[in-house]
């Protein structure tokens, strides 16, 4: 059995240039793998679409924080 977890590399090459309303967002994933050209966030929308966004943008960081709080509050 392998001693480390192997995950397929997902990269963002382009990021969305407009804000996504928070109520449309379901979850996010951080992309920090150095084999990717830039650090990014992949938002999953409630319709199942995945969108790359730039974590340097304020709305992206605020959305991540909002989703963190929602998921924390859902925990038993």
């Amino acid at each position: 059995q392998p001693d480390s977890v192997s995950i397929p590399i997902t990269c963002c090459f382009n990021v969305i240039n407009r804000k996504i309303p928070i109520q449309r967002l379901e979850s996010y994933t951080r992309i920090t793998n150095i084999q990717c050209p830039k650090e990014a966030v992949i938002f999953k929308t409630k319709r199942g679409k995945e969108v790359c966004a730039d974590p340097k943008e304020r709305w992206v960081r605020d959305s991540m924080k909002h989703l963190d709080q929602i998921f924390q509050n859902l925990k038993p």
């Epitope: 920090t32 150095i34 650090e39 340097k56 963190d68």
Partner: antibody, heavy 117, light 107 residues
Framework: QVQLVQSGAEVKKPGSSVKVSCKAS????????MHWVRQAPGQGLEWMGR????????KFDPKFQGRVTITADTSTSTAYMELSSLRSEDTAVYYC??????????WGQGTTVTVSS | DIQMTQSPSSLSASVGDRVTITCKAT??????LAWYQQKPGKAPKLLIS???SLETGVPSRFSGSGSGTDYTLTISSLQPEDFATYYC?????????FGGGTKVEIK
Amino acid sequence: QVQLVQSGAEVKKPGSSVKVSCKASGLTISDTYMHWVRQAPGQGLEWMGRIDPANGNTKFDPKFQGRVTITADTSTSTAYMELSSLRSEDTAVYYCARGVFGFFDYWGQGTTVTVSS
Amino acid sequence: DIQMTQSPSSLSASVGDRVTITCKATEDIYNRLAWYQQKPGKAPKLLISGATSLETGVPSRFSGSGSGTDYTLTISSLQPEDFATYYCQQFWSAPYTFGGGTKVEIK
């Protein structure tokens, strides 16, 4: 692969300033934030501040505000940290590190700064 | 500022032991917690981010858990190369702060 290579060790007098450099390869520094973290001998880690090299925006721990300057030169992929009004308590290893999200996945090798009269 | 309290500050263990290190924040940090390993004379190495996400290449014997203000790093079966100092760090809000560290020594 990513490398952050820092400048060499420094010995400084109290009251003087030190400037440490951090040259990045294998990444575009304007795509990330560059942070500075220090570690006094035998002590823990202490975040000092960070810069967004794309626009020069900085954020600092208030403890260091006014005494630390962080700059970046995207043309040479180098970040700099200057600490002024040095005192003996500033004797530490200073690290640069990268990360947009507030955690640090790549670190420099560290630069030892000794403040002694 | 958010303060991070790590315990124990040191522990002695043997190869094969299960080791648990805890970290407590002074306020909810919503899983924005990282764990690092540091060996003498070296820079810290990121093990876990987001409280539970193992970094690529980090052995699966390392795991993170917790929520709210309380978080745990577990090494399921301690290996010789795991003797080091471990730090937690919150990245919920700047200034980002670290725990005081836990030194894992050979018993």
